[in-house]
C-alpha cells in the first residue's frame, strides 16, 4: 500500500503565439481545482476500469479575478497536495491524466458553473520510494507544471510496496545499516544500494547494484537527458571546439514521435507534433475515451464518432456539460446580475446583490451616472454596467476630487523635462528636440521632422 | 401588451433545418426566459428547453440534447429554436412560453404555435 | 425526471357543474406548478401559477389547490367556453413536465 502524490506548481499559458485570455474575467471571477486519474501504464490493462489505481479531486484554488488588459498569468493554485492512495502492489509503469477544471463564480453562485479547462495525459515509470519527479504537459494553450511521486505506506518498502518491514520495538541484532524484515522476522535486509554514482532523481534501482532510468533519462547513471546529444564521440581534448568527428543521430533520427506525429529538433531535444487525438511527450497518448471515465456524476460515456470527440457524456437529469459536471439547479440560468448571489427559496429564486446594485435581478446600477456627481468639472461616463468621471485636466480619482500631478505618466519625450502648470504641463525640451511633447527632433539644418501635412 | 409571435408553419424534408422564431414584444425580454414546448398531432405537451436571454445560458430537457439550439437576438427581442437533421418524429407544433426569470409565475404568455412538418 | 401524472385523462360535464382535475407529481414540488388550459387549435393559456395563485384575466371561478406532491384544479360552475384541455406543469426542476391533459367535453 501508498500513496501517488501529485503537486501542481503552476498553471497558465504556454509559450508561443496565441496565449489563452484568461479563464477569469472581471464580471465573473473564477478559481481553479484539479483532478488526476491514475491508471496502470500497460498496455494490456488499457480495458480496466476508469482510474483503476485511484483518482483524487484537489481544493479549489483562490479566487481569480482577471485584471482588464492584462495577459493571462500563471492562475492562483489549490493549496496541498493531491493524493491517491493506493491498496496493492505499486505499478512501476503508470498512465495519468491531469484535468483543470474551471468553477466560475459572480452569478452563477447560487450554483457552480464547472468547466474543464485542459486535460493533459501521460504514460511514466516510477519506482516508489524515489525522489519527486517534474513535468510540464501542454494541452492547447494552456501550459501545466507539476511533480509526482509514489511512497510506500508503513510496514510496505520497495519499489513496488510489496514488501513489508516493520521496525521491532526490541533491539535489533542486525548490525548498523541493516533493519529487521518481517514477516521473515530472523533475517536482515540491507537497504536497497544502486549503483554507485545513479542519479536519485533521474535513476532507481530494483536490484542492488544495477541503475534503471526514468522516463526521458538514458546513460550509465541516467544523468544524460535523453537526444541531448548529437555525438556518438566527442572531439578530443586538444579540439577547443565542440562537435562531432563523426555525425551522429540526431534527436529526429528514426522519428521517435509515434502515431504519425512529425518530429522538429529544439536545442536541447526533440519536439512532436501530434496529430489529432494524440499528445504526449512522443504522441504515445492516444485521445481520452471512454475507459479514462471523463464523465462525472454517473453520467453514461459513449465512444465518439470521429477523433475530433473521442468521447461523448450522456448526462443523467440534472447535470449537463460535456463532461457531466454541472450541476442543473434553478439557479443555473443566471438570474441574478452584476455577481449578485441567486438564493432557490423553494417557492421562487431571490438574488442577493453586491453592494452597489439593486433591483430584483441587481440591475440597477447604484452608483450609476444618474445620481452621480464629478468634482472639478468632471463629467460622468456609463459603459459596460459601469462608470466612471472623465476628469478635467489636472483632476483625477474616482470623482474626480483629487489633484492629479500631469507630469506623472512622464509625458515629456526623448529627455525633455516636464514641469506642472495650472492649466496643464508644459515641456522643457533637451537640446535637439521640439514640439509640445517634444516628439519631434530638430534637424541639423534648421528644419524639423514634422510630419507632413 | 405582452405578444409573442412566432414565425409561419415550415414543410420541410427529413434531413433539412428550420429556425423557428419567437418575437417578444410589451415587456422587458431580458427579464424573463423563454421556454420552448413542443406538441405533437393529436398529443400532449413536452418542454423542450429554456434560454436566459438575457446572459444566453440555456438548459435542454434531455430528450432535446444535440438536433436542437435555442438562441436570442437581444437587439431585435427575438428568440429562437433551430432543429437540424429534421426527422418525421419532429413534425409538431412547436411553442414558445415566457416566464419571469425568477420563477415568481409560470409560463403565463404563450407564441400562437408555429406548425413544421417534415415530410418526404 | 419528475412525472406528473394527471386524472382524469377525459371527463364530460355540463354547464354550471363543478369540475375537479388532480394532479401527482412523483415527489414533492413545493407549489411550483401551474395548470394550463388550451383550445382546440389555440396556443396553452396560464390559468393558475405557484398552485393556487390566479392569472391576470382568469375568471375567478378557477382556483388551485394542494402542497407537496398532490395538486387539484377546480372550476367552481362550468361555463360554455370552459371545454377544453387542461394540463398541469412542475417547475421545480429541470426539465419541467407536464401531465398528460385532462379533456373536458360537454356531457
Known amino acids: 500500500a501508498g500513496v501517488f502524490e501529485l503537486q501542481i506548481h503552476s498553471f497558465g499559458p504556454g509559450p508561443g503565439p496565441g496565449a489563452p485570455r484568461s479563464p477569469c474575467s472581471a464580471r465573473l471571477p473564477c478559481r481553479l481545482f484539479f483532478r488526476v486519474c491514475l491508471k496502470p501504464g500497460l498496455s494490456e490493462e488499457a480495458a480496466e476500469s476508469p482510474c483503476a489505481l485511484g483518482a483524487a479531486l484537489s481544493a479549489r484554488g483562490p479566487v481569480y479575478t482577471e485584471q482588464p488588459g492584462a495577459p493571462a498569468p500563471d492562475l492562483p493554485l489549490p493549496d496541498g497536495l493531491l493524493q491517491v492512495p493506493f491498496r496493492d502492489a505499486w505499478p512501476g509503469t503508470f498512465s495519468f491524466i491531469i484535468e483543470t477544471w474551471r468553477e466560475e463564480l459572480g452569478d452563477q453562485i447560487g450554483g457552480p458553473a464547472w468547466s474543464l479547462l485542459a486535460r493533459v495525459a501521460g504514460r511514466r515509470r516510477l519506482a516508489a520510494g524515489g525522489p519527486w519527479a517534474r513535468d510540464i504537459q501542454r494541452a492547447g494553450a494552456w501550459e501545466l507544471r507539476f511533480s509526482y511521486r509514489a511512497r510506500c505506506e508503513p510496514p510496505a518498502v520497495g519499489t513496488a510496496c510489496t514488501r513489508l518491514c516493520r521496525p521491532r520495538s526490541a533491539p535489533s541484532r542486525c548490525g548498523p545499516g541493516l533493519r529487521p524484515c518481517a514477516p521473515l522476522e530472523d533475517e536482515c535486509e540491507a537497504p536497497l544500494v544502486c549503483r554507485a554514482g545513479c542519479s536519485p532523481e533521474h535513476g532507481f534501482c530494483e536490484q542492488p547494484g544495477e541503475c534503471r532510468c526514468l522516463e526521458g533519462w538514458t546513460g550509465p547513471l541516467c544523468t544524460v537527458p535523453v537526444s541531448t546529444s548529437s555525438c556518438l564521440s566527442p572531439r578530443g581534448p586538444s579540439s577547443a571546439t565542440t562537435g562531432c568527428l563523426v555525425p551522429g543521430p540526431g534527436p529526429c533520427d528514426g522519428n521517435p514521435c509515434a502515431n504519425g506525429g512529425s518530429c522538429s529538433e529544439t536545442p536541447r531535444s526533440f519536439e512532436c507534433t501530434c496529430p489529432r487525438g494524440f499528445y504526449g511527450l512522443r504522441c504515445e497518448v492516444s485521445g481520452v475515451t471512454c475507459a479514462d471515465g471523463p464523465c462525472f456524476n454517473g453520467g453514461l460515456c459513449v465512444g465518439g464518432a470521429d477523433p475530433d470527440s473521442a468521447y461523448i457524456c450522456h448526462c443523467p437529469p440534472g447535470f449537463q456539460g460535456s463532461n457531466c459536471e454541472k450541476r442543473v439547479d434553478r439557479c443555473s440560468l443566471q438570474p441574478c446580475r452584476n455577481g449578485g448571489l441567486c438564493l432557490d427559496l423553494g417557492h421562487a429564486l431571490r438574488c442577493r446583490c453586491r453592494a452597489g446594485f439593486a433591483g430584483p435581478r441587481c440591475e440597477h446600477d447604484l452608483d450609476d451616472c444618474a445620481g452621480r456627481a464629478c468634482a472639478n468639472g468632471g463629467t460622468c461616463v456609463e459603459g459596460g454596467g459601469a462608470h466612471r468621471c472623465s476628469c478635467a485636466l489636472g483632476f483625477g480619482g474616482r470623482d474626480c476630487r483629487e489633484r492629479a500631478d500631469p507630469c506623472a505618466a512622464r509625458p515629456c519625450a526623448h529627455g525633455g523635462r516636464c514641469y506642472a502648470h495650472f492649466s496643464g504641463l508644459v515641456c522643457a525640451c533637451a537640446p535637439g528636440y521640439m514640439g509640445a511633447r517634444c516628439e519631434f527632433p530638430v534637424h541639423p539644418d534648421g528644419a524639423s521632422a514634422l510630419p507632413a501635412a | 401588451e405582452v405578444q409573442l409571435v412566432q414565425s409561419g408553419s415550415e414543410l420541410k424534408k427529413p434531413g433539412a433545418s428550420v429556425k423557428v422564431s419567437c418575437k417578444a414584444s410589451g415587456y422587458t425580454f431580458t427579464d424573463y426566459y423563454m421556454n420552448w414546448v413542443k406538441q405533437a398531432p393529436g398529443q400532449g405537451l413536452e418542454w423542450m428547453g429554456i434560454?436566459?436571454?438575457?446572459?444566453?445560458?440555456?438548459i435542454y430537457n434531455h430528450k432535446f440534447k444535440g438536433r436542437f439550439v435555442l438562441s436570442v437576438d437581444k437587439s431585435s427581442n427575438t428568440a429562437y429554436l433551430q432543429i437540424s437533421s429534421l426527422k418525421a418524429e419532429d413534425t409538431a407544433v412547436y411553442y414558445c412560453?415566457?416566464?419571469?426569470?425568477?420563477?415568481?409565475?409560470?409560463?403565463?404568455?404563450w407564441g400562437q404555435g408555429t406548425t413544421v412538418t417534415v415530410s418526404s | 425526471d419528475i412525472q406528473m401524472t394527471q386524472s382524469p385523462s377525459s371527463l364530460s360535464a355540463s354547464v354550471g357543474d363543478r369540475v375537479t382535475i388532480t394532479c401527482h407529481a412523483s415527489?414533492?414540488?413545493?407549489?411550483?406548478m401551474g395548470w394550463l388550459q388550451q383550445k382546440p387549435g389555440k396556443a396553452p393559456k396560464g390559468l393558475i401559477y405557484?398552485?393556487?395563485n390566479l392569472e391576470d384575466g382568469v375568471p375567478s371561478r378557477f382556483s388551485g389547490s394542494g402542497s407537496g406532491a398532490d395538486y387539484t384544479l377546480t372550476i367552481s360552475s362550468l361555463q360554455p367556453e370552459d371545454f377544453a384541455d387542461y394540463y398541469c406543469v412542475q417547475y421545480a426542476q429541470f426539465p419541467y413536465t407536464f401531465g398528460g391533459g385532462t379533456k373536458v367535453e360537454i356531457k
Open positions: 434560454i436566459n436571454p438575457y446572459s444566453g445560458v440555456t
Open positions: 412560453a415566457r416566464q419571469d426569470s425568477l420563477l415568481d409565475y409560470a409560463m403565463d404568455y
Open positions: 415527489q414533492g414540488i413545493s407549489g411550483n
Open positions: 405557484h398552485g393556487a
